[in-house]
């Protein structure tokens, strides 16, 4: 008789990333008997929830249940019914909810309470909804990319999983950009840190890692734009803001009350003689870059060296994976190739920003205007953040790899979060088992 593989014992896990601009649900699967091996967990589905981030539901919490329905139902379809009850569900909220909590713990609690009640109604093993710290967000993103790149594996391979993977065990740094915060996490050369708040120690698969991490709240691309607008409107002579970060011919009316809604613009808040102002794009990369640089306070540093705003940053070390909005924006601008130098990126940004808005709309007819209008700012912001904020140079630029997925799994904090909460990253290297997970009869 022909040998027939017995059905694998597969496990599933669900993580919801409740970001500032939207929520995404990720479904992961792995062979049960290999759950302590490195690199066996992979993403089988991403479902993007329709609508804004959960922090925007403060005024309409009764709509949260409906908001989550489609993606939770999708999870019900993807995961075999027999596995539902043992499939853990975790929701982690990030900077959008950190900002809401900063304004009001009550409102943040209320949103999370309704989210928890909604998720408890599904047949899965709901493990809770919480606001994760910026440090966790950075650390789990670092764990995710290094897990997927096989950096924790003690077995050196004769092949490369992904084009930029080297066969050495040096970990990649992680650069994460969201709508409301950005994280930088890496293993510095020097293990002593001047700032204990930024230091993390891990023991993973039998190896110790001393990791630097920092999350810059308000420096995600959306909140950075609000900051820039609040800063620039202070010196506007009237209710017209001629803005170099938007394409020539672009026009948009902004409510002052919306501008000052976020704690991120608090330092720029002032009484203005108007309730609304109009952004008029002038599309000038160089001027936009200068305006963005004013968001980074580099004049004060209580350490040997800083990123910006007095935050310690050790010298950059090794390769970095830049994901989430770093990737989405650079991918839209077609600037993710390893061959594109920093000078070339700057040149392309100058060209892109100076293109008339009408031309841009025609060239990218399928893209929502709200998103389309902000790529000039976002691209400029990414360059400014990486070069002036984190001190990458034209030379070290080649060490930045813009990553969307690794081996079919999205780069981001969610996989690392689940691996940690399900205890799937052992401190010690597991003993290798003689049998593979497929048993033949």
């Amino acid at each position: 008789t022909q040998n027939k593989a017995l059905p694998e014992n597969i496990k599933y896990g669900i993580v919801l990333d409740a970001g500032s601009s939207h929520t995404s649900l990720y479904i992961y699967k792995w062979p049960a008997e290999k759950e302590n091996d490195t690199g066996v967990v992979h993403q089988v589905e991403e479902c993007r929830v329709k609508g804004p981030g959960i922090s925007k539901y403060v005024q309409k919490v009764n709509e949260i249940g409906i908001y989550l329905t489609d993606c939770m139902e999708r999870a019900r379809e993807v995961i075999p019914r027999s596995q539902h009850q043992e499939t853990p569900v975790y929701l982690g909220a990030t900077a959008g909810m950190r900002l809401l909590r900063m304004e009001s713990e009550e409102l943040a609690d209320r949103v999370l309470d309704v989210v928890e009640r909604s998720l408890s109604n599904y047949p899965f093993d709901f493990q809770g909804a919480r606001i994760i710290t910026g440090q966790e967000e950075g650390a789990y993103g670092w764990i995710t990319i290094n897990y997927l790149l096989g950096k924790f594996s003690q077995k050196t391979r004769w092949f490369s999983i992904v084009p930029y993977e080297t066969n050495n065990q040096e970990t990649f740094g992680a650069l994460d950009l969201g709508g409301a915060s950005t994280q930088i996490t890496f293993v510095p050369q020097n293990q002593t840190t001047e700032s204990p708040d930024n230091a993390l120690q891990f023991r993973l698969y039998g190896k110790d890692y001393n990791v630097y991490t920092h999350s810059f709240l308000c420096y995600g691309k959306d909140q950075a734009l609000w900051q820039k607008l609040a800063k620039d409107i202070q010196v506007a002579s009237n209710e017209i803001l001629r803005d170099p970060c938007f394409h020539p011919g672009y026009k948009k009316v902004v409510n002052v009350s919306d501008l000052y809604k976020t704690p991120c613009t608090k330092r720029f808040e002032m009484t203005l003689p108007f309730q609304q102002f109009e952004i008029q794009g002038i599309g000038n990369y160089q001027q936009c870059h200068q305006s963005v640089l004013e968001l980074f306070n580099t004049s004060y540093c209580p350490y040997s060296q800083c990123a910006f705003n007095g935050i310690f940053l050790p010298p950059l070390q090794g390769d970095f994976g830049a994901f989430s909005a770093f990737y989405f924006v650079m991918n839209f601008l077609n600037l993710t190739s390893e061959k594109v130098s920093q000078e070339k990126v700057t040149e392309m940004m100058k060209k892109f920003c100076s293109q008339p808005w009408e031309e841009i709309k025609t060239s990218y007819a399928g893209v929502k205007e709200k998103y389309l209008s902000e790529y000039c700012f976002s691209g400029t912001y990414i360059l400014s953040l990486l070069l002036q904020g984190y001190h990458f140079t034209a030379d070290s630029w080649e060490h930045i790899h813009f990553i969307g997925k690794i081996q079919g799994s999205d780069a981001g904090w969610t996989l690392g979060y689940m691996l940690n909460l399900t205890n799937m990253i052992p401190a010690e290297q597991p003993l290798s088992t003689p049998l593979s997970h497929s048993t033949y009869v």
């Epitope: 403060v58 950190r98 009001s104 609690d109 209320r110």
Partner: antibody, heavy 116, light 111 residues
């Protein structure tokens, strides 16, 4: 655990300024606002203002605008409240309190006495 | 400014008996379905301690005998069975809008 530790008692002359510090520990300092509340002897609690440690933006009660300044040193996780042009009615215990809208954690208080 | 009026100014209650303190706001302190109303306990020489937040939620480590109720403009703090250690001044506070304001306080004593 969350702790707010304030500087010691001060005696000041009318017209002088006082600067009270509040050192925070046990949480990410920039994730929560820091408020200042005072209480004159035998009087009700009086909210003065708050700061967003994240960026140094502050808001004050009208009564203290122009006379009170709130600052932070994020590297030291410390907030400061400075009150200028002191008068005898500023004699009070000054408290820092962590919160957005919920003042769950308070400093032990700093007694400021204004006397000629 | 929202004015918070507490009553009574002082209250003497026998041990084990119920104590009720009222607080009236000059305008509603509700927003987005949440009451931005808080109750604090303050003992001599100590900072205030949060008892109740959001009008009816117990603060961390607060005994079950303390409860809060109300919405809009009228709120109540109840101590179901007064204990000796509950002797203190109790304050209500609103944080719906700046300036955040406190009530005048209610002194609770043992009869």
């Amino acid at each position: 655990q969350v702790q707010l530790v304030q500087s010691g008692a001060e005696v000041k002359k009318p017209g002088a300024s006082v600067k009270v510090s509040c050192k925070a520990s046990g949480y990410t300092f920039t994730d929560y606002n820091m408020h200042w509340v005072r209480q004159a002897p035998g009087q009700r609690l009086e909210w003065m203002g708050y700061i967003v440690p994240l960026n140094g933006g502050s808001t004050f009660s009208q009564k203290f605008k122009g006379r009170a300044t709130i600052t932070v040193d994020t590297s030291a996780s410390t907030a400061y409240m400075e009150l200028s042009s002191l008068r005898s009615e500023d004699t009070a215990v000054y408290y820092c309190a962590r919160g957005g809208t919920r003042f769950a954690y308070w400093g032990q208080g700093t007694l400021v006495t204004v006397s000629s | 400014d929202i004015v918070m009026t507490q009553s009574p100014d002082s209250l003497a209650v026998s041990l084990g008996e119920r104590a009720t303190i009222n607080c009236k706001a000059s305008e509603s302190v509700d927003n987005f379905g949440v009451s931005f109303m808080y109750w604090f306990q303050q003992k001599p020489g100590q900072p205030p301690k949060l008892l109740i937040y959001g009008a009816s939620n117990q603060g961390s480590g607060v005994p079950d005998r303390f409860s809060g109720s109300g919405s809009g403009t009228d709120f109540t703090l109840t101590i179901s069975s007064l204990q000796a250690e509950d002797v203190a001044v109790y304050y209500c506070q609103q944080t719906k809008e700046v300036p955040y304001t406190f009530g005048g306080g209610t002194k609770v004593e043992i009869k």
